[in-house]
């Protein structure tokens, strides 16, 4: 097979245009991801077959392997097959995209393994993280196939910069099924405690007759034995367990504790592990951030949300305005704090059709004997804006007014607009806007009011039209962050005796 | 502790279903995707698809499309594969896994066994 260009590799630019060729003695085929492209196959007088691809409007996507084999019933050797590698440099293509198969990958034993992320750019420096770190690992790269190395059952992802921006790959997941016959299973009653506190572990084996325990823990570093217990689960054929008690924990006894159990029979072992914190005193922390401005919309329900961490349990209380809140009979509010997870806390308070009175300065209290966090923030109730009232009148001065009155929070932006063509406006042609500075035949003039009680602004505008010389629809539209509503007033000339 | 606890082991004729379960605890249910991951007698590890169990969206290698459906139901944490148009070749032991970004976690592998 004779390839031209000969490759191996190819760097070409982005929208071009380029032809690949290749020739045999047999019927040749070009292949990208295990299909064939478009191609022209062709036979020569001298008995030589070739296939010529053309690549044009060249992409970043255009990356990647090309293959020129034979495409004969004969079944020539297999080996009969060239190699292109095509990198087309594109800054609008970051990691070429992956199937969702190679973003996991499957090991049964510890082995080489490649985690497939690729650039455009040959020139790029890629860089292997751990999804948790920020630490580039020292793996190997290469640029048509990714990093290979033998790797830890973790997520990674690959970085690189292109041009002045940072850009990340999917992640890939690396699962290591360790294999084994012993199914072992290891589980603290709880995996934090506070000093002169329990520590009780249970080891347990399912499917074995004949096992031996063997437990490693801090403490048996220091030489201070445990002697565990071990005992049958008689409801459950061939359940073993060992109990690993330790009483009156102290801060040393923090660390990790791993059950190692061997079979004899079959020499088959497995161990799991884990980890225990024994802590000074008791905590409490809160996760994540609350603002200290929280929005609710009048007459929808709205939940605010503390997540937490607390050892032990804590009590969790909720106040409005310095009183305490509880769930009320009548339903408009509800409390709930729930575990998600032995240290781990969601404490929600959700308001049922908010009404105004909600408003205010909101407490969440978590507390027990050794520590206590609280969080505080101010609820506002948004409350669509509408319009009250919109009237026409023209005083002696000649001029006429248009006042619009109208309520909303947070506080209403007022725009006013007016078709001069009845009949075309506002389907046909866009309104006019009104009360810019520039425009001399109308003036306006905006008063706002803030009402304590009611919670919420008033806006008050008038218009003042100069000459107005035929019939006139004037609107008025506020707007706030929830809504906005919109009325509007024909406005007659002086001079036509009809309104 | 995360655990992942699967169904026992089944045996079925050919062109029948199976649905392997997976009970999920020591974690929130929602937060980490469901792999389903099986192995032949004597050959390696082969990915069926994932099921992410906070939407209920799926996704199935081309090789299982049409014959594997992939459910859960978050009330009792528990994940769902069954494979339907069983043959020979469908022999395997069957495991759920999951990734907590530090490491994996599987289940303990359900045999399932196809003969007339």
């Known amino acids: 097979l004779v390839v031209t260009p000969p490759g191996p590799e190819l760097v070409l630019n982005v929208s071009s245009t380029f032809v690949l060729t290749c020739s045999g003695s047999a019927p040749v085929v070009w292949e990208r991801m295990s299909q064939e492209p478009p191609q022209e196959m062709a036979k020569a007088q001298d008995g030589t077959f070739s296939s010529v691809l053309t690549l044009t409007n060249l992409t970043g996507l255009d990356t990647g392997e090309y293959f020129c084999t034979h495409n004969d019933s004969r079944g020539l050797e297999t080996d009969e097959r060239k190699r292109l590698y095509i990198f087309v440099p594109d800054p609008t293509v970051g990691f070429l995209p992956n199937d969702a198969e190679e973003l996991f990958i499957f090991l049964t034993e510890i082995t080489e393994i490649t985690i497939p992320c690729r650039v455009t750019d040959p020139q790029l420096v890629v860089t292997l993280h751990e999804k948790k770190g920020d630490v580039a690992l020292p793996v190997p790269y290469d640029h048509q196939r990714g990093f290979s190395g033998i790797f830890e059952d973790r997520s990674y992802i690959c970085k690189t910069t292109i041009g002045d921006r940072e850009v990340d790959s999917d992640a890939y997941y690396v699962y290591r099924l360790q294999v084994s016959s012993i199914n072992v299973s290891v589980n603290a009653v709880q995996t934090v405690v506070r000093q002169g506190e329990n520590i009780t572990l249970m080891c347990i084996v399912i499917g074995n007759e004949v096992v031996n325990f063997e437990w490693t823990y801090p403490r048996k570093e220091s030489g201070r034995l445990v002697e565990p217990v071990t005992d049958f689960l008689l409801d459950m054929p061939y359940h073993i367990r060992s109990i690993l008690h330790i009483p009156s924990a102290e801060l040393e006894d923090s660390g990790t504790y791993t059950c190692n159990v061997t079979e004899s029979v079959n020499d088959h072992q497995d161990e799991k592990a884990i980890n225990i914190t024994v802590v000074e005193s008791g905590y409490v922390r809160l996760l994540g951030e609350v603002g200290t401005l929280q929005f609710a919309e009048l007459h929808r329900s709205r939940t605010l949300q503390v997540v937490f961490e607390a050892y032990p349990p804590p009590t969790v209380l909720w106040f409005k305005d310095n009183r305490t809140l509880g769930d009320s009979s009548a339903g408009e509010i509800a409390l709930s704090t729930r575990n998600v997870s032995e240290t781990r806390y969601v404490s929600e308070l959700t308001l049922v059709r908010v009404k105004v009175a909600e408003a205010g300065h909101y407490t969440m209290r978590a507390f027990h004997e050794d520590a206590e966090v609280q969080l505080s923030f101010q609820l506002q109730i948004n409350v669509p804006v509408r319009v009250l009232e919109l009237s026409e009148s023209h005083p002696d001065s000649g001029e006429q007014t248009v006042r619009c009155r109208g309520r909303g929070m947070p506080q209403p932006n007022i725009i006013w607009s007016a078709c001069r063509d009845l009949k075309r406006c506002p389907r046909e042609l866009p309104p006019t806007l009104l009360g810019n500075s520039s425009e001399e035949e109308s003036q306006l003039e905006t008063n706002v009011t803030y009402w304590e009680e009611e919670q919420e602004f008033e806006v008050v505008s008038t218009l003042r039209l100069q000459h107005v010389d035929r019939p006139l629809s004037v609107r008025c539209t506020l707007r706030n962050a929830v809504g906005q509503d919109t009325q509007e007033v024909i406005v007659v000339p002086h001079s036509l005796p009809f309104k | 502790q995360v655990q992942l606890l699967e169904s026992g082991a089944e045996v079925k004729n050919p062109g029948a279903s199976v649905k392997v379960s997976c009970k999920a605890s020591g974690y929130p249910f929602s937060a980490y995707y469901i792999q389903w991951v099986r192995q032949a007698p004597g050959q390696g590890l082969e990915w069926m698809g994932w099921l992410n169990p906070n939407s209920g969206d799926t996704h199935s290698a081309q090789k299982f499309q049409g014959r594997v459906t992939m459910t859960r139901d978050t009330s009792i944490s528990t994940a769902y594969m069954e494979l339907s148009g069983l043959t020979s070749d469908d022999t395997a032991v069957y495991y759920c896994?999951?990734?907590?970004?530090?490491?994996?976690?599987w289940g303990q592998g359900t045999l399932v066994t196809v003969s007339s």
């Open positions: 896994a999951t990734h907590g970004g530090d490491r994996s976690y």
